[in-house]
């Protein structure tokens, strides 16, 4: 009896999560990613904001930049030049889109402990970076690229045609930033800093999305963004390379586009330097099932870049689009011509292949009914990658090492047995030559970051173990989480179920489905999170389920490409199927089932509510897409083709939320959107609202003035409070 009495008294001192806990970020965790500067050294910003250099081999650390210097210019970020002579300090951060921001930059000279005066950088700068060797600077100001040989030198202007919303040099336009490059920059230094490659995006002919930004003035401002929606005119991209040693000598040289790509609309997808005189460019047809990787060499005699047809490698998908979310990028071998790359094998699973002369002759390095996810590093004798192979759980990530310096190549899982219960989802960060690496474990237990020897894999030290978080959670009744699978009609539906702390299978609980469901996404992951749905389970006694249906990633092409050209069908069907299976489990109150989602999830939740199944009592859509004709070309056409009669217009029309307005009559619907959403335009929700009004269907709505797709800041608190009230009302839970 005693142990159970102790247990009960402990349980009495424990409390449920509150909404306040979530909104205050009380249970957020920290990760530690070393800022590697050599094989055995890294920089890190200490708790007191000093920039400290750590040497793993000597065990010594010293401050290279004091918090006083940081504070003197109000710096929120820094960057050390590779020759360790200068540091740039970044302040006045001003967010633009998902990755892009502008800032003011100051250069601090470490040799004399003073800021560089004379030829100061203009402000605000859109992007700035050091050369990989020495201390040259490249930066983008007012859509033009500038070069400095030394921080105190006058700048050399590389481009002159940059114009706001028209021509972008060295930075992407909106659609390339969000849907193709996933970066704020579009310039790349060669490994030793001899050349600088950059993209020029011409948005002159792109239609503009315009929306009001209300601000505090008498008249609202109009935000204009060149934004190609499905089927619209796209940016025209060109890639140039300039010799930074003698930039004025021949000027920027354009890199030729492969003929088979240039014959119709196309995209540039990524650039990878191989050596100072060899560069690899990846191109994609507008119909994104053909990708071409082109390896180009510098011709000293002509001072031009030559991309021979024999160095063009074509990747084509016959069952869907090329790649996963993006086409994978190559990791070059030390011979500077062959490379490793992830693409679908003959069985339809994404695996690492080694390509030398042709893609047809590729050697498959990994294989199995699982997927290789990322290649972290290739050295002379090892290849490090992540996959979801271990124990056949697609929502896990472990790090593997393949010994490629000997035959047969042997494979070792570096992380599988390190902290098996706590850590099942890893990423890694490697120093030069993979001498050392950091492992960052995201869960399912409390995240932990550790440092390891690159040769032996031995753990050297813990970098961050979130002790404070662990202590804070000691008296919290966290929900239980389980990850399992349903087998339905030859489809495996993995799900995560979040259960109230005192879950009792014999009782009935309200069910909330949280859905994203976008192509190549994954919601069912073995990661730690204390978030809104944790609170709903812990305090409000709800069961929450996340289901990865057709169209989701890392389980093979059959599941992934099932939604090709048919968005809005199977994703919704699979959520409904899962709900029916959950009801069969016996602990779900089938009169109290809700669904909610954000962005693509808002689209799926809307379609599920309007499916006419009678399964859902209520639901929420935050910033949903409502018609694929309203969304960005690069993303939408990848999965849907073009909205033209001879392509896929019919399904574009059939897959709108508006077409199902009548079906919302028997559900409680909460529609939410930010008016300054640059990504999924407010237009989407405006059209849903119009269709519902026209159909005389009652619904609830909330807009967030001047908020973008993230609904951040005070809007976040308001949003989650509002959604909580809505769900509690729907489920007849007392406030």
């Amino acid at each position: 009896l005693r142990p159970s009495r102790v247990h009960n008294s402990e349980e009495n001192t424990m409390r449920a999560l509150t909404l306040k806990d979530i909104l205050n970020g009380t249970f957020s965790y920290k990760t530690f990613f070393p800022n590697w500067i050599s094989g055995q050294e890294y920089l890190h910003q200490s708790a007191d904001n000093n920039i400290v250099l750590y040497n793993i081999e000597t065990g010594q650390s010293y401050t290279i930049l004091s918090n006083r210097t940081m504070k003197s210019v109000n710096a929120s970020n820094y960057g050390l030049s590779p020759d360790r002579q200068f540091v740039y300090l970044e302040s006045d951060y001003s967010k633009l889109w998902r990755y892009s921001y502008t800032a003011t930059y100051y250069i601090y000279d470490l040799s004399n402990g003073e800021f560089v005066r004379g030829n100061e950088l203009p402000r605000p700068i859109q992007y700035l970076c050091w050369s990989p060797v020495g201390s040259k600077l490249a930066y983008v100001y007012q859509n033009n690229i500038y070069l400095k040989q030394r921080p105190g030198d006058p700048p050399f202007q590389i481009t002159f045609n940059g114009r706001e919303n028209k021509i972008f040099n060295g930075i992407p336009d909106w659609v390339y930033e969000e849907e193709m490059l996933a970066t704020k920059y579009a310039l790349w230094w060669s490994p030793n800093g001899k050349f600088l490659a950059y993209a020029e995006f011409n948005d002159t002919d792109i239609p503009v999305i315009a929306y009001s930004y209300y601000g505090d003035e008498q008249y609202p401002r109009t935000i204009n963004i060149p934004y190609p929606k499905a089927g619209a005119k796209n940016p025209v991209v060109r890639i140039f390379i300039i010799d930074t040693t003698y930039p004025a000598y021949v000027g920027p040289q354009e890199v030729p586009v492969p003929a088979m790509i240039a014959s119709s609309d196309y995209y540039f997808s990524w650039l990878t330097w191989v050596t100072d005189e060899r560069v690899c460019l990846q191109w994609l047809k507008r119909v994104q099932n053909v990708s071409v990787l082109s390896i180009c060499d510098f011709r000293e005699d002509w001072q031009t870049w030559d991309c021979p047809k024999t160095q063009e490698h074509i990747e084509e998908s016959r069952t869907g689009w090329a790649g996963g979310f993006f086409v994978s990028t190559p990791v070059f071998s030390y011979d500077a011509i062959s490379y490793y790359k992830i693409f679908s094998d003959k069985d339809g699973y994404k695996h690492i292949h080694y390509i030398k002369d042709t893609v047809e002759n590729a050697i498959q390095i990994t294989s199995g009914k699982w997927e290789a996810i990322n290649i972290f590093r290739v050295t002379q004798d090892s290849l490090f990658y992540s996959s979801n192979e271990f124990e056949e759980y697609p929502g896990r990530r472990n790090i593997y090492r393949i010994s490629i310096g000997s035959y047969p190549p042997s494979k070792k899982c570096v992380t599988c047995h390190l902290r098996k219960e706590r850590c099942q989802y890893y990423t890694a960060s490697f120093s030069d030559y993979a001498k050392y690496y950091a492992l960052v474990c995201y869960g399912p237990g409390i995240p932990i970051s550790t440092l390891h020897d690159g040769r032996t894999d031995q753990e050297i030290k813990i970098l961050e173990e979130n002790k404070e978080l662990e202590n804070a959670l000691k008296n919290i009744q966290l929900p239980k989480e389980e990850i399992k699978k349903l087998e339905v009609d030859e489809i495996t539906l993995w799900y995560k179920m979040i259960l109230p702390p005192q879950f009792d299978r014999s009782k009935k609980y309200p069910l909330l489905i949280q859905v994203y469901g976008g192509p190549c996404s994954q919601s069912v992951r073995s990661v730690f999170a204390v978030n809104w749905i944790s609170y709903l389970a812990s305090k409000e006694g709800m069961v929450i389920a996340l289901v990865d249906g057709r169209g989701t990633a890392f389980q093979g092409d059959k599941l992934l490409y099932a939604v090709y050209r048919k968005l809005g069908v199977y994703e919704v069907e699979d959520q409904i199927t899962a709900v029916r299976k959950f009801i069969e489990m016996g602990f779900i109150d089938e009169k109290r089932i809700a669904i909610w989602g954000w962005s693509y999830g808002g689209y799926v939740s809307s379609l599920a509510l309007a499916s006419g199944t009678g399964l859902f009592k209520c639901g929420i859509a935050v910033a949903p897409v409502s018609s694929w004709e309203y969304y960005a070309s690069v993303y939408t056409e990848r999965f849907m083709g073009l909205p033209t009669k001879d392509d896929n217009l019919e399904h574009y029309k059939n897959s709108t939320v508006m077409a199902r307005a009548e079906y919302f009559r028997n559900v409680d619907y909460l529609l939410i959107h930010g008016t300054a959403d640059d990504n999924v335009h407010f237009q989407n929700s405006a059209q849903i609202a119009k269709a519902l009004v026209n159909a005389q269907v009652d619904f609830q709505a909330m807009w967030y003035s001047d908020q973008n797709h993230g609904l951040s800041g005070l809007s976040t608190n308001h949003l989650y409070t509002h959604m909580t009230h809505f769900l509690k009302q729907c489920f007849s839970l007392s406030d």
Epitope: T310, D335, K356, I363, I404, G405, S406, Y407, P408
Partner: antibody
Framework: EVQLLESGGGLVQPGGSLKLSCAAS????????MSWVRQAPGKGLEWIGE????????NYTPSLKDKFIISRDNAKNTLYLQMNKVRSEDTALYYC???????????????WGQGTTVTVSS | LVMTQSPASLSASVGETVTITCRAS??????LAWYQQKQGKSPQLLVY???TLADGVPSRFSGSGSGTQYSLKINSLQPEDFGSYYC?????????FGGGTKLEIK
Amino acid sequence: EVQLLESGGGLVQPGGSLKLSCAASGFDFSTYWMSWVRQAPGKGLEWIGEINPDSSTINYTPSLKDKFIISRDNAKNTLYLQMNKVRSEDTALYYCAGGYYRYPYYYTMDYWGQGTTVTVSS
Amino acid sequence: LVMTQSPASLSASVGETVTITCRASGNIHNYLAWYQQKQGKSPQLLVYNAKTLADGVPSRFSGSGSGTQYSLKINSLQPEDFGSYYCQHFWSTPYTFGGGTKLEIK
């Protein structure tokens, strides 16, 4: 000591068949890429084809693809060359060669047998 | 890919330095090997990766080149160096050989 010993050569009539063997010893045969190379009298070397350690990849010179078959038996440490529909121009000294794995993913022909002579004549 | 070796033959004296060249019809990216074959014997690997000496090969042999042009240099010829030399690429199948260079004593 590494040894490659070819056998099975001899006189064969045009249109006939012959199977050459190459017995390996002194190294881990099952981890080596193996090749066949031939040398016509007074001429240079001609690469016939290769086989990787687990026989999953076999490549041939295009002109010989349809008449020669390369195989191996790792349990017996033996490499084979099945020659079909031979003609007088197939008269040559046939070498087997074994290669170290060289990163990244290719091999070199480090070890050679002494060769076996095939004469095609009626 | 066609490998063109030159010269087809050359005469040299002991102690001299000779260079044999090999031209590929396309870029073979240093995937090149050199072999020596003495009369009545099997070929022997000298160089791989265009410039790496195989185990046990004397340092008077050296390989160089890139792209489509490669060469084998023999410094201070020794009596045992006379014979035939072949280049072979390993870029893509078929791994063709050059026509050979016969090195004779002058």
